[in-house]
């Protein structure tokens, strides 16, 4: 059988080989499609209810004015020419519909490195056969279940038209230190060959690098945190993340009532300033991160400064924020 591919809604003409070009003709068409059970016979003489779907033209060809999904199947013509020679034509008709350009909906503007993120949902409407959706990163195909990539797919069929709607939700786990502006796109590949893929417009979410806890560095001057009475201690909270987070300070696990600042200065140290200090970096996009704690202690003249002083009183003494 000769394979014929026809677009849904378009007309189709199937030639009856060997048929006389005009009546009288001895020919018959046989159809076995979604509209028939077994075979339906159509002849040049018989105009009727089937004419809206398929009718025999004066030249013996079969004319389908608007091909539908139910017209998929086998079409056969048997014709006899003026000399009594019989010729058979055999067609296998498959139909297709190209959907509208796929779109990425619910797309993320920002992804977080190191954790799974929903990038977006690719939607294609009105295809037949269903076809497939695939995702691309920087122009290269993304393989599901590899390197933190997962895809959730859904296929629905319109109850009246029989056309398909495809949905594909992409989840990725961006690597730390990777591309800060990856380019994602999605493409629809038709279920029938010889039709090119349709690609969405690309999306370029930003990748945000969360600052791990150990990266919130607390630097103490003098080193070790041991200082003579009346001396000055400078605590600096270093956070490499951009944009700069808000820094708050804690003493002995209690927030200090001070405005946010990356530097805390303790001038004229007294016993009440002794204790354990830490800083807390608060990012707009996720929760707070606390630094390691350091002990501030007073050493009497002649003593060796300990690396970790004992916890002192709870008084704040005099604090200065840089």
């Amino acid at each position: 059988a000769q394979n014929i591919t026809a677009r849904i809604g378009e007309p189709l003409v199937l030639k009856c080989k060997g048929a006389p070009k005009k009546p009288p003709q001895r020919l018959e068409w046989k159809l076995n499609t979604g509209r028939t059970e077994a075979w339906k016979v159509l002849s040049p003489q018989g105009g009727g209810p089937w004419d809206s779907v398929a009718r025999v033209l004066p030249n013996g060809s079969l004319f389908l004015p608007a091909v539908g999904i139910q017209d998929e199947g086998i079409f056969r013509c048997q014709a006899m020419n003026r000399n009594g020679k019989e010729t058979k034509s055999n067609y296998r008709v498959r139909v297709y519909q190209i959907p509208g350009k796929p779109e990425i909906v619910d797309s993320a503007s920002e992804l977080t490195a190191g954790v799974p993120n929903k990038v977006g949902t690719c939607v294609s409407e009105g295809s037949y056969p269903a076809g497939t959706l695939s995702w691309h990163l920087d122009g290269k195909p993304l393989v599901p279940n590899e390197k933190g990539v997962s895809v959730k797919e859904q296929t629905r069929r319109h109850p009246e038209t029989g056309l398909f709607t495809l949905q594909s939700e992409l989840m990725v786990t961006p690597a730390r230190g990777g591309d800060p502006r990856p380019t994602f796109s999605c493409s629809f590949s038709p279920g029938l060959p010889r039709h090119r893929a349709l690609r969405t417009a690309p999306i370029q979410p930003r990748v945000w690098e969360p600052v791990p806890l150990e990266e919130v560095q607390l630097v103490v001057e003098p080193e070790g945190g041991a200082v003579a009475p009346g001396g000055t201690v400078t605590l600096t909270c270093e956070v490499p993340a951009q944009p700069s987070p808000q820094i708050h300070w804690m003493k002995d696990g209690v927030p200090l009532p001070l405005p946010p600042s990356p530097v805390l200065i303790l001038p004229e140290i007294g016993p009440q300033d002794q204790g354990t200090y830490s800083c807390v970096a608060t990012h707009s996009s996720h929760g707070p991160q606390e630094s390691r704690a350091v002990s501030i202690s007073i050493i009497e003249p002649g003593e060796e400064g300990p690396t970790a002083g004992s916890v002192g009183g709870s008084g704040l003494g005099t604090l200065a924020l840089a």
Epitope: T36, A38, G47, P49, W50, D51, S52, V53
Partner: antibody, heavy 119, light 107 residues
């Protein structure tokens, strides 16, 4: 609301002519074949004529062929039945109905119009 | 031409009864048979299309089935409003042919 309304029925003498009309509303008229069906008093239903959506092809049973003509005006959403050489046996209620092909067959009907052929 | 032989031509039944009406086509018409209900002085109303499909707004007590060239309309539990005349229609070929009708009366 999908609606079909027939008009034009009445009393006519044998050999006379009558033109029936059917006004369609509530659907895209030129997407559908249309059909006339009749019912003689106390009898069953009988197909009279069908026309395809463009109006290019018309279909009749032998009982009315060459006497009746079905036509349509898609711009006016109207279906017509021109009846000539009327006989007593044409007396019936005439219904217009949507469809008539294998895709849609007589899913919506008008209320009917009575044609009486009598001297 | 295709003949549609409908039986019975009339039947008497009571509310709640199961009623079956059949049409036999004289040749293969595929699935292209409809069933209609008609009440006195009213236009026919399509109940079943393409042999087995329930038309919009039709109660589920109506159903259609097909076995070869035999087509059946079943009313599972007859209701007072179901007393009417029922017709089958073949629309696979011209001339379109109706069955002779079945009048369902109150017993």
């Amino acid at each position: 609301e999908v609606q079909l309304v027939e008009s034009g029925g009445g009393l006519v003498q044998p050999g006379g002519s009558l033109r029936l009309s059917c006004a369609a509303s509530g659907f895209t008229f030129n997407n559908y074949w249309m059909t006339w069906v009749r019912q003689a008093p106390g009898k069953g239903l009988e197909w009279v004529a069908s026309i395809d959506n463009s109006g290019d092809n018309t279909y009749y049973p032998d009982s009315v062929k060459d006497r009746f003509t079905i036509s349509r005006d898609n711009a006016k959403n109207s279906l017509y039945l021109q009846m000539n050489s009327l006989r007593a046996e044409d007396t019936a209620v005439y219904y217009c109905a949507r469809g008539g092909d294998i895709l849609v067959s007589l899913d919506v009907w008008g209320q009917g119009t009575l044609v009486t052929v009598s001297s | 031409d295709i003949q549609m032989t409908q039986s019975p031509s009339s039947l008497s039944a009571s509310v709640g009864d199961r009623v079956t009406i059949t049409c036999r086509a004289s040749q293969d018409v595929g699935i292209y048979v409809n069933w209609f209900q008609q009440k006195p002085g009213k236009a026919p109303r399509r109940l079943i299309y393409r042999a087995t499909n329930l038309a919009d707004g039709v109660p589920s007590r109506f159903s259609g089935s097909r076995s070869g060239t035999d087509f059946t309309l079943t009313i599972s539990s007859l209701q007072p409003e179901d007393f009417a005349t029922y017709y089958c229609l073949e629309f696979d070929e011209h001339p379109l042919t109706f069955g002779g009708g079945t009048k369902v009366e109150i017993k």
